[in-house]
């Protein structure tokens, strides 16, 4: 296929979803924020886990007053289409609107460093994965979820928040990189392109795909989003890649129906809970990770970016809804929200599996030219 | 205060149908999913029936689909039940509950004071 | 019932008495919260429990939860008269249409 160095499931093929739109910033109630029995949250009003930033949008986070010690994901910069669709700028402009939220856009000016310094960091995000250079991990163990599986109610919030569709998770999805390496899902997002155009925001060996998803989640080791920005691991985002298939995603048509509704920047919807596991690869056991960042500003790093090997197959019908519904700021239609892969400075991206190891004629001596950091583990 | 207080419940012949309704009030009403739960005599709870707050999607047992209908009216802060097709096993005592939402999983946190619905020829 | 509970437990005043709640890999084993409810004789049920561990105000800290792997359970210490009463576990089940679940109750007898 399309990844001619991917082992078995043809590269990266075959069936899920992910993650986009990172953090939703905090509004992670602490645990000591139960609700009184007077007048509890009601189905739209969860303590701290509306408003999780956005891995775009993350701002400079402030909780919200009325719940303490949450903050929101909205808090977050806003998208708009970048000029050039294949390889969008890390540019973004930015307005003093209320309490200091930045704004910022997809391809245009100032760059985005200077909407967040971070943002011109060694070690950002996304990045281009070469199989064959990816070094093998043994000690990277299956993907972990408990959670996932959300009741129908309470509902869940489905925002257009100028730069992505994002859904926020209620608390409770827990997910394990390994043990000891516990976190809280948060938000997801997805990034897309636009007809003809792909908008994956990875890519593999320089191939993009049609979208991808971005579940983020937070370390049990932090309370708050701000407490875990640019700190190693406080942020983990899992992140899958949607391709092209034969038929209907039942799980993804959930909540692409919804898109209609939500069409206007800022708007939003509430929809069932669903099984988020089934956005994701069924495949938790093959996948790329390597240390890295928001995708969008702040830029933060210390993110572990989890990229599964499998894809997730949606229609085509699908894939035109998700690049052809919404629209972003200035009457500009959201399209092409992702940005330009970044240099790895000598990053090594990790993989659970062979990846270098390859069965196609193309590579004749299949070389695994870095070791595996966690070895020792 | 807090508090629902229903109505409607009584002696329905097999085949029949009745209309239950519950009224809200101390709480901002469309921010709550409401739900019908049931206790047939000397038996345990079992859950009926579920409505967003919005009242937009609506959630049914097994044994109910196709024969209840749950609805509300935000404007009136209150919750119905339409019970068609009556059956004997309907009999129980009926309740509404709010949906208090705590971290996201909901709890049925406060309770109607029921009503007896006998489905007898 | 796919969430069991005992028909009933008893104890002395001034005990400490569980009621346990057992499921499985699709309802308190997937990782949903199970919350308790109290029904006293001839009243409505009233929450009791709430996320596993959680007393909502003005529920005695008498009353705890836990929850561990697919089974939970709930604790009275300092047993009280008041407290004979039948007691529910709730939770949710993705393999029933009829997500939401309760336990068949168990009937707490304060000798």
């Known amino acids: 296929q399309r990844l001619p160095r991917m082992q078995e499931d043809s590269p990266l093929g075959g069936g899920s979803s992910g993650e986009d739109d990172p953090l939703g910033e905090e509004d992670l109630p602490s645990e000591e924020d139960s609700p009184r029995e007077e007048d509890p949250p009601g189905e739209e009003d969860l303590p701290g886990e509306e408003d999780l930033p956005g891995e775009e949008d993350l701002p400079e986070v402030k909780p919200k007053s009325e719940e303490e010690g949450s903050l929101k994901l909205e808090d977050l910069p806003t998208v708009e289409a970048p000029g050039d669709p294949q390889e969008p700028q890390n540019n973004a402009h930015r307005d003093k609107e209320g309490d200091d939220q930045s704004h910022w856009r997809y391809g245009g000016d100032p760059p985005w460093p200077r909407v967040s310094p971070a943002c011109a960091g060694r070690f950002q995000s996304p990045v281009d994965i070469r199989p064959q250079l990816a070094a093998f991990c043994p000690a990277l163990r299956p993907l972990e979820l408990l959670g996932f599986q959300l009741p129908p109610l309470p509902e869940l919030r489905l925002r257009n928040n100028g730069h992505s569709v994002q859904l926020t998770l209620p608390p409770g999805l827990e997910m394990a990189l390994g043990p000891g390496r516990e976190y809280r899902a948060l938000q997801l997002h997805l990034h897309w392109g636009a007809a003809g155009r792909p908008g994956s925001e990875h890519t593999v060996e320089g191939h993009r795909f049609p979208a991808e998803i971005h579940v983020v989640h937070l370390s049990t080791a932090f309370a708050r989003v701000d407490e875990a920005l640019g700190r190693p691991g406080g942020l983990a985002v899992l992140a899958a890649f949607l391709e092209e298939g034969p038929e209907e995603n039942s799980a993804y048509e959930q909540l692409l129906s919804r898109l209609e509704e939500i069409a206007e920047e800022g708007s939003e919807t509430q929809v069932p809970g669903l099984d988020i596991s089934a956005l994701l690869p069924s495949d938790f056991s093959r996948y790329f990770q390597y240390e890295g960042s928001l995708t969008t500003p702040p830029c933060a790093q210390g993110v572990i970016w989890t990229v599964f090997n499998q894809t997730v197959m949606l229609s085509a019908k699908q894939l035109h809804t998700l690049s052809d519904t919404l629209w972003g700021p200035g009457d500009s239609r959201l399209q092409l929200n992702f940005r330009a892969t970044q240099p790895l400075n000598g990053r090594v991206i990790e993989a659970s599996f062979p990846a270098g190891v390859d069965s196609s004629p193309r590579a004749a001596e299949p070389v695994q030219l870095n070791s595996c950091l966690a070895a020792g583990d | 205060q807090v508090q629902l207080v229903q109505s409607g419940g009584g002696l329905v012949q097999p085949g029949g149908s009745l209309r239950l309704s519950c009224a809200a009030s101390?709480?901002?009403?469309?921010?709550?999913?409401m739900s019908w739960v049931r206790q047939a005599p000397g038996k345990g709870l079992e859950w009926v029936s579920a409505i967003s707050g919005s009242g937009g999607s609506t959630y049914y047992a097994d044994s109910v689909k196709g024969r209840f209908t749950i609805s509300r009216d935000n404007s009136k802060n209150t919750l119905y039940l339409q019970m068609n097709s009556l059956r004997a096993e309907d009999t129980a005592v009926y309740y509404c509950?709010?949906?208090?939402?705590?971290?996201?999983?909901?709890?049925?946190?406060?309770w109607g004071q029921g009503t007896l619905v006998t489905v007898s020829s | 019932q796919s969430v069991l509970t005992p028909p009933s437990v008893s104890g002395a005043p001034g005990q400490r008495v569980t009621i346990s709640c057992t499921g499985s890999s699709s309802n308190i084993g997937a990782g949903y919260d199970v919350h308790w409810y109290q029904q006293l004789p001839g009243t409505a049920p009233k929450l009791l429990i709430y996320g596993n561990n959680n007393r909502p105000s003005g529920v005695p800290d008498r009353f705890s939860g836990s929850k561990s792997g697919t089974s939970a359970s709930l604790a009275i210490t300092g047993l009280q008269a008041e407290d004979e009463a039948d007691y529910y576990c709730?939770?949710?089940?993705?393999?029933?249409?009829?997500?939401?679940?309760f336990g068949g109750g168990t009937k707490l007898t304060v000798l």
């Open positions: 509950a709010r949906n208090g939402n705590y971290r996201g999983s909901l709890a049925f946190d406060i």
């Open positions: 101390g709480f901002t009403f469309s921010s709550y999913a």
């Open positions: 709730q939770s949710y089940d993705s393999s029933l249409s009829a997500w939401v679940v």
